[in-house]
């Protein structure tokens, strides 16, 4: 098989027929050196998953529930291309899971017990995970095994792919519980047919199923949707009456050597030639010999899943947790004031050492999780491996786009009521050596620049945003002759000035000596022409306040600020000579952890905050010898946000807009992944 062949996995005779047609039609439109299709037939989706993992096939389209199974070891598959619904202009990478009933049946969502149920398939999203996830904790005990509990709840079911021997009631309405289209009640259209034929009382499907199966409005009017407020609505009101929004079906491939670029190349060309309204002789999103063959008939096209996105990120924390809870039989305990330990995310070695010290001193209230970059930390918080960390505003933006929320803000000024009064922010400045007297904001081109890190507020978003408005392109590495902007591509001129050794060069963590505020200032002192930092950086590292050899003899008077009007001012005049006001760093977490992170951190700062006077013999949360480990060293307290409890409200409209403009220049793979899920 040539290397440019994608072996597509088909799960029925009808799918295999469509796959062969797909193969032949692609041959006719794609040059011989382009991607080609080969077809592999298996008995079920699970067999396809195993075949791909074993390198006997390369790709299959799966429901989100099965994407989770495909991701689990030993399969280790990942989503690579997603179907989208809606239109090309407004593509939706989700659909609605709904409960369809006949109009005259007269029961509500909270009266499903004893009814007959029709499911698309065991472990599938709209047909199983969502409805059973909603019903599960209301099921009578014992709830394990899950299939038995469901079988006892309904008076009869068709749940294709269930074990008919162990759980015959789940196959009562579709003898055999076959796991492919050989079973007339399999899949979306099958589950709807189960309801239509009168075998079942309720069908758990997707919002478009009824439209795809009943072209006539009068026929559709014989059906209704069950809503979560225990009412019913007409089938076209699914946006106001659904069980959940489910991530769209997606093509999966191996995580390693999975041909993901080739699969995308193939499908992208396929949608160009055979997508919606493209060709009469073969249509990718149509199934003349059945329904939803290879791809969903309701799909409008494909979108490439960002490479950073694994299955957990694609499905989202809520869905993964719902599936886990369902499979493990976990139901909520009665609410309690007890908080589980907060898992703090520490960046690289230095932060981990401080975090471990914190953990010991907290007596089990804080646990530590490590990651190499801020983005890796954010991803860990998203998927539940970690719970919280304190972030620069630029990363608060990314975290917010990824669904996290700010919970407390760092405050840098001493005040009587520090914890109750979040500050307006700090100043982003451009520092130069006084001796370079001809340097101004207007002639920075070709100079050597020092940045805290790519994506951070004072070091990147603010100065580069202003620069972008001036030069109208993103090639900042061409604007400056060289520089150190940790997090840049290693071969970029913006890594040339960095001092990290080997693999640590230009890394966005403390292993790179020029990382962060202090690092960027050190870069200016030793190699650069301009440093983009915060207004406190120069005084914090001069006049003997930083004892490190490179800093101990520095004098604040030897540095000046660049003002946007082309003038320069002394460092202490930052209030009249800055680039912009930056939002303070803030602690972020997931919504479900918000209350506990808030509570535990407030306890922790009362024990280890700035009220501790001797940090030589005691643990101090906000000290790390100017390294800004875990928190900025000039933090006085962590303050309540009051109503500024979303990333937009916290950062403010102006900053969100500025970072939004700079998104065109973003190299953040995480931001790309998160905006794929929530544009």
């Amino acid at each position: 098989v040539p290397d440019k062949t994608v072996r597509w996995c088909a799960v029925s005779e009808h799918e295999a027929t469509k796959c062969q047609s797909f193969r032949d039609h692609m041959k006719s439109v794609i040059p011989s050196d382009g991607p080609s299709v080969a077809c592999v037939k298996k008995a079920s989706y699970l067999d396809c998953i195993r075949a791909i993992a074993a390198n006997e096939a390369d790709a299959v389209t799966l429901d989100a529930g099965l994407v989770y199974d495909a991701y689990l070891a030993p399969n280790n598959l990942k989503p690579v291309v997603a179907e989208f619904y809606g239109s090309k202009e407004d593509p939706q990478t989700f659909y609605y899971a709904v409960a369809v009933v006949k109009k005259d049946s007269g029961f509500q969502m909270n009266q499903l017990r004893g009814k007959k149920s029709c499911h698309t398939g065991l472990g599938r999203s709209a047909g199983w995970n969502i409805p059973i996830g909603l019903l599960y904790c209301d099921l009578p005990e014992p709830r394990k095994p899950l299939e038995k509990a469901v079988a006892n709840f309904f008076s009869g079911s068709c749940a294709p792919c269930a074990d008919g021997t162990d759980f015959p009631q789940l196959c009562q309405l579709c003898p055999g519980c076959g796991c492919s289209t050989l079973n007339q009640y399999f899949g979306y259209s099958g589950a709807f047919k189960c309801l239509k034929d009168g075998a079942g009382d309720v069908a758990f499907v997707k919002h478009s199923t009824i439209f795809e199966n009943l072209a006539n409005k009068a026929d559709r009017d014989q059906y209704e949707l069950l809503c979560l407020d225990n009412t019913r609505k007409p089938v076209d009101e699914y946006k106001d009456c659904h069980l959940a929004q489910v991530p769209s079906h997606t093509v999966v491939a191996r995580s390693m050597g999975g041909k993901e670029d080739l699969i995308w190349e193939l499908l992208n060309q396929a949608q160009e030639h055979f997508g919606k309204d493209k060709s009469k002789e073969f249509q990718l999103f149509s199934s003349p010999h059945g329904k939803d063959l290879l791809f969903k008939d309701s799909a409008h096209g494909f979108l490439k899943v960002p490479p950073r996105m694994d299955a957990k990120m694609y499905l989202g924390y809520e869905y993964v947790t719902a599936i886990r809870n369902l499979r493990e039989g976990t139901c909520p305990e009665a609410p309690t004031d007890e908080c589980k330990p907060v898992k703090w995310c520490a960046l690289s070695h230095h932060e981990r050492l401080k975090c471990d010290e914190w953990s010991v001193n907290s007596v089990g209230k804080i646990e530590c999780v490590s990651a190499e970059t801020t983005e890796d930390c954010i991803a860990k918080i998203m998927n539940g491996e970690a719970d919280a960390m304190s972030l620069d505003g630029g990363f608060v933006y990314i975290a917010g786009k990824c669904g996290l929320v700010p919970v407390l803000a760092e405050n840098y000024n001493k005040s009587d009521n520090c914890e109750d009064t979040p500050e307006a922010g700090y100043f982003a400045i451009a520092v130069v050596k006084k001796s370079a007297s001809d340097l101004t904001w207007d002639n920075l081109k070709g100079k050597k620049s020092c940045h805290t890190a790519v994506g951070r507020t004072a070091g990147w978003n603010i100065p580069m945003g202003l620069l972008y408005n001036k030069i109208n392109h993103c090639r900042f590495d061409e604007f400056f002759s060289e520089g150190c902007a940790p997090g840049s591509k290693k071969d970029s001129s913006l890594c040339k000035l960095c001092m990290g050794s080997g693999l640590n060069l230009c890394e966005p963590n403390n292993k790179e000596g020029y990382y962060g505020y202090t690092g960027a200032f050190r870069c200016l002192v030793e190699k650069g022409d301009v440093a983009f930092v915060k207004h406190q950086t120069v005084p914090q590292n001069t006049g003997g306040k930083n004892p490190d050899p490179w800093a101990k003899n520095l004098n604040e008077k030897d540095y000046e600020l660049l003002c946007l009007d082309g003038t320069r001012k002394p460092v202490e005049e930052y209030a009249n000579c800055h680039l912009a006001r930056a939002p303070n760093h803030a602690v972020v977490t997931r919504k479900d952890k918000e209350a506990c992170v808030h509570k535990i951190l407030r306890q922790q700062q009362h024990l280890f905050g700035s009220n501790v006077t001797d940090c030589s013999g005691n643990f101090c949360l906000f000290r790390s010898e100017t390294k800004d480990l875990l928190f900025r060293d000039d933090t006085v307290c962590l303050a309540k946000l009051h109503d500024r409890n979303t990333y937009e409200k916290y950062l403010g409209e102006e900053y969100v807009k500025a970072v939004g403009n700079l998104r065109k220049c973003s190299t953040s793979s995480l931001l790309e992944a998160c905006t794929f899920r929530r544009p």
Epitope: F94, D229, L243, Q245, C331, P332, E333, P335, D592, R678
Partner: nanobody
């Protein structure tokens, strides 16, 4: 969305009783558990008692044996029977509902919902 409305608060003498109600409306089928919280002036909000749809309960130590939480699933209402009230029970009492994980998939539901609160004042 879920809307929560508290009622039953008021002024009562120490040793007296009150019964708070919390009526839930909207997507009540998404609710996994409900709770009563309270906040006294100048203090943090604290949990008083919680209950799941299955009926398991939990109480703060300070109210154990005096307060009873209950739920009428058919009426979508939660209650807090407060006996032997003390001046330190004076606070605004809030109703809270936490949603089921499956209901939150794709951002379909919030993590939790809160009522506006009802004032309970216990005079000595």
């Amino acid at each position: 969305q879920v809307k929560l409305e508290e009622s039953g608060g008021g002024l009562v003498q120490a040793g007296g009783s009150l019964r708070l109600s919390c009526a839930a409306s909207g997507n009540v089928f998404t609710i996994a558990a409900m709770a009563w919280y309270r906040q006294a002036p100048g203090k943090e909000r604290e949990l008083v008692a919680g209950i799941t749809t299955g009926g398991s309960t939990n109480y703060a130590d300070s109210v154990k044996g005096r307060f009873t939480i209950s739920r009428d699933n058919a009426q979508n209402t939660m209650y807090l029977q407060m006996n032997s009230l003390r001046p330190e029970d004076t606070a605004v009492y809030f109703c809270n509902a936490v949603t089921k994980w499956a209901a939150r998939v794709g951002g379909s539901a919030e993590y939790e919902y809160w009522g506006q609160g009802t004032q309970v004042t216990v005079s000595s």
